[in-house]
Interface confidence: low
C-alpha cells in the first residue's frame, strides 16, 4: 500500500518544498556568483578534500547515526540528506548576506560551502531530538528557523567578541543541543499505548547507527580544524581531535561494560560516546599544547557521555518526550558545555601566561558569548516548537509517530495505513 | 633572510591590465597571509588586497573590487596582483607584505595581525 | 568600513622631546592595531602591533596605548632617526585600513 499522507500535506508538502527551492534559484541567480580568481591548485584540492569531508559527516555519519529506530531509519537517513542539502543552500546565501552583502553579490567559495555544511551539520544534530515525530514540511521549516537562528549567532558573536570562523562555529554543539531539546519540548509527547515498540533499536539498523558513528569517528578532526586559519593550529586541531575521540571510544565500550549489572555493552551508549572526545575538544582544539591533556579530555567526555546515557534518558524522555536511543541532545549539551568550560579554563592559564592582566574581562567575554549562544538557542527553538505545532503542517499524529509507512512507499508491505 | 622580492611594475594605458609578482624567500610561504598596499606619489599607505596562506580567502578595498584579482602560488612561493580596468588614480608603488601573527593571549583568537616583512616596492604608472 | 583618522597630519619635535601622535578608528576595534614607520623613499617598517606591543628590534622610546577607538604613539626622547611618517592600521575585520599618517618633522 501506498503511504498515505494526510492529503492537505500531500498538496502542501511538494509545493511548499518546491517553492522554496524555486526561491533559492532566483536568489542565487540574482546574488551570487563564484570567485573568480585564480585559486592555487594544490590548494584547491586540500579545501575540497575539507569540504568532502563535512559532507560525508552530514550525509553518511549524521544519516546513518539517527537511523538505529526499528521502524524509522529509511526516514532518518533521508530526511537528514533532505535538511542537509536545503540547509547547506540557505547557509550559503545567509552567511553571504550577512557578510558580504554590502558589496552588492555574495562571492562563493570553496571555504562558503565549507562553512554553510558546518552550518546545516547544525540542523543534523539538533533534529535527532525530534526525528519521528514531524513530517518534512515540518523539517523545511526547522532548517530555515535553525539555519537563520545560527547564522545571525555567529554574526552577532563575530562583531561583538571579535572572535574567527573557528571560533564561533565551535558554538554549534552547544547551539544545536539546545535548540532541538527545546524544539522537542513543544512538541507532543505522549506515545500512546501500543506505539512503545516503534522508538526501540533493532539490530540492523543499529548496525547502520555504528556505520555512521564511525563515518563520524573518522572524520571529526577534518570538522574542528575545518574553520582555522594557521597551518599550525590546523594541526594541532587535527592531533587532538584524534587522540581524544580515539581515548573516548576506548572510555565509551569499557565504561559501557561497567555501568551493565551483568557487564554488557550497550549499543546506543557507543553510538554517541565514540564522538565524545570530538565534541569536548572542539572549541579549545588548537590551543592544546600536548596530547596528553587532549587525551584526559576524551577520557572525561566518554565517561560522562556514558554516564549521561545511563542515567538522563529517562528524565528527558518524561519532560522532552525524547526517546532512549535519541540521546545525541543532551550528550552534546553536556560536552559542548564541558567544551566551552575547558576553553575558559585554558583561556585564565593562557591569560596568566601573557601577564597582560585581562583575565577577568577574557573569562567575561567568553561567557558571554556561551550564554548568548545558549540563549538565542533556546529562544529560537521555542518559536520553531510553536511553528511545528500550528495545524497546517498536519503532523504525524502521536499513534504513528516513528513509522516509516506514514512517510514511504513499501510495495511489499500489505499494512496500510 | 626573509625577503619579499617584487616584480612587473610599468607604464600602462588607463583601461589596459599589468600582473605585479611579489616571489619570496627565507620563510615557509604557504604559512602566510599575504598583502597588497599602494602609495600614490606624495600620499599615504592605502591598502588594496589580502590572501589567506591557503588561497581560500581573499578581500579587498572597495577603491579595487572587482578590477583586482590577488592569488597566490605557493608552490612557486610567489604572491600575485593582476590589476586589469587600470585608472590613472592606480598610479603608485604598490607593495606586497607578509602578514605577521602575533599571539596576545593564545585563546580567545587575541592574535594581532600585522604586515612585518615588506618587498621593496613596485612603480605602476598608468598615463595615456 | 572602518576608516582610520590620524592627528595631526604633521607636527614639529625637538630633539630629546616627546611627542604623541593619536589614531581614531571609526568603530571598535579592540586592541588590533599596528604602528608602521616609513622615511622618505623607505619601506614602511612595522613598529608596534596589538596597540602596545613593541616589535623586536624597535627602540623602548616607542609606546603604544589605548583600545576600542583611540589610539596613541608616543615618541619619548625623540632622535633624528624618528622623523618619518607614522602610520596606524587597524586589522581587526577582513580589510586593512591604514590612517592617512602623522609626519614628524623636527623643530
Known amino acids: 500500500m501506498s503511504s498515505k499522507y494526510p492529503r492537505s500535506v500531500r498538496r502542501c508538502l511538494p509545493l511548499w518544498a518546491l517553492t522554496l527551492e524555486a526561491a533559492l534559484i532566483l536568489l542565487f541567480y540574482f546574488f551570487t556568483h563564484y570567485d573568480a580568481s585564480l585559486e592555487d591548485q594544490k590548494g584547491l584540492v586540500a579545501s575540497y578534500q575539507v569540504g568532502q569531508d563535512l559532507t560525508v559527516m552530514a550525509a553518511i555519519g549524521l544519516g546513518f547515526l539517527t537511523s538505529s529506530f526499528r521502524r524509522h531509519s529509511w526516514s532518518s537517513v533521508a530526511f537528514n540528506l533532505f535538511m542537509l542539502a536545503l540547509g547547506v543552500q540557505w547557509a550559503i546565501l545567509l552567511d553571504g548576506f550577512l557578510s558580504q552583502f554590502p558589496s552588492g553579490k555574495v562571492v562563493i567559495t570553496l571555504f562558503s560551502i565549507r562553512l554553510a555544511t558546518m552550518s546545516a551539520l547544525s540542523v543534523l544534530i539538533s533534529v535527532d531530538a525530534v526525528l519521528g515525530k514531524v513530517n518534512l514540511a515540518q523539517l523545511v521549516v526547522m532548517v530555515l528557523v535553525e539555519v537563520t537562528a545560527l547564522g545571525n549567532l555567529r554574526m552577532v558573536i563575530s562583531n561583538i567578541f571579535n572572535t574567527d570562523y573557528h571560533m564561533n562555529m565551535m558554538h554549534i554543539y552547544v547551539f544545536a543541543a539546545y535548540f532541538g531539546l527545546s524544539v522537542a519540548w513543544c512538541l507532543p509527547k505522549p506515545l500512546p499505548e501500543g506505539t512503545e515498540d516503534k522508538d526501540q533499536t533493532a539490530t540492523i539498523p543499529s548496525l547502520s547507527a555504528m556505520l555512521g558513528a564511525l563515518f563520524l569517528w573518522m572524520f571529526w578532526p577534518s570538522f574542528n580544524s575545518a574553520l582555522l586559519r594557521s597551518p599550525i593550529e590546523r594541526k594541532n586541531a587535527v592531533f587532538n581531535t584524534y587522540y581524544a575521540v580515539a581515548v573516548s571510544v576506548v572510555t565509551a565500550i569499557s565504561g559501557s561494560s561497567l555501568a551493565h549489572p551483568q557487564g554488557k555493552i550497550s549499543k546506543t551508549y557507543v553510538h554517541s560516546a565514540v564522538l565524545a572526545g570530538g565534541v569536548a575538544v572542539g572549541t579549545s582544539c588548537h590551543l592544546i599544547p600536548s596530547p596528553w591533556l587532549a587525551m584526559v579530555l576524551g577520557l572525561v567526555a566518554g565517561l560522562i557521555s556514558v554516564g549521561g546515557a545511563k542515567y538522563l534518558p529517562g528524565c528527558c524522555n518524561r519532560v522532552l518526550g525524547i526517546p532512549h536511543s535519541s540521546i545525541m541532545g543532551y550528550n552534546f549539551s553536556l560536552l559542548g558545555l564541558l567544551g566551552e568550560i575547558i576553553y575558559i579554563v585554558l583561556l585564565v592559564l593562557d591569560t596568566v601566561g601573557a601577564g597582560n592582566g585581562m583575565i577577568g574581562f577574557q573569562v567575561l567575554l567568553s561567557i558571554g558569548e556561551l550564554s548568548l549562544a545558549i540563549v538565542i538557542a533556546l529562544m529560537s527553538g521555542l518559536l520553531t516548537g510553536l511553528l511545528l505545532n500550528l495545524k497546517i503542517w498536519k503532523a504525524p499524529h502521536e499513534a504513528k509517530y516513528f513509522d516509516d509507512q506514514v512517510f514511504w512507499k513499501f510495495p511489499h508491505l500489505a499494512v496500510g495505513f | 633572510q626573509v625577503q619579499l622580492v617584487q616584480s612587473g611594475g610599468g607604464v600602462v594605458q588607463p583601461g589596459r591590465s599589468l600582473r605585479l609578482s611579489c616571489a619570496a624567500s627565507?620563510?615557509?610561504?604557504?604559512?602566510?597571509?599575504m598583502h597588497w598596499v599602494r602609495q600614490a606619489p606624495g600620499k599615504g599607505l592605502e591598502w588594496v588586497a589580502v590572501i589567506w596562506y591557503d588561497g581560500s580567502n581573499k578581500y579587498y578595498a572597495d577603491s579595487v573590487k572587482g578590477r583586482f584579482t590577488i592569488s597566490r602560488d605557493n608552490s612557486k612561493n610567489t604572491l600575485y596582483l593582476q590589476m586589469n580596468s587600470l585608472r590613472a588614480e592606480d598610479t603608485a608603488v604598490y607593495y606586497c607584505?607578509?602578514?605577521?601573527?602575533?599571539?596576545?593571549?593564545?585563546?580567545?583568537?587575541?592574535?594581532?595581525?600585522?604586515?612585518?616583512?615588506w618587498g621593496q616596492g613596485t612603480t605602476v604608472t598608468v598615463s595615456s | 568600513d572602518i576608516q582610520m583618522t590620524q592627528s595631526p597630519s604633521s607636527l614639529s619635535a625637538s630633539l630629546g622631546g616627546t611627542v604623541t601622535l593619536t589614531c581614531r578608528s571609526s568603530?571598535?576595534?579592540?586592541?588590533?592595531l599596528n604602528w608602521y614607520q616609513q622615511h622618505p623613499g623607505k619601506v614602511p617598517r612595522l613598529l608596534i602591533s596589538?596597540?602596545?606591543r613593541l616589535q623586536r628590534g624597535v627602540p623602548s622610546r616607542f609606546t603604544g596605548g589605548g583600545s576600542g577607538t583611540d589610539f596613541t604613539l608616543t615618541i619619548k626622547n625623540v632622535q633624528p632617526d624618528d622623523i618619518a611618517t607614522y602610520f596606524c592600521q587597524h586589522s581587526y575585520r577582513s580589510g586593512r585600513a591604514f590612517g592617512q599618517g602623522t609626519t614628524v618633522e623636527v623643530k
Open positions: 568603530q571598535f576595534i579592540s586592541r588590533y
Open positions: 596589538g596597540a602596545s
Open positions: 627565507g620563510f615557509t610561504f604557504s604559512s602566510y597571509g
Open positions: 607584505a607578509r602578514e605577521t601573527v602575533v599571539v596576545a593571549a593564545k585563546i580567545r583568537n587575541h592574535y594581532y595581525y600585522a604586515m612585518d616583512v
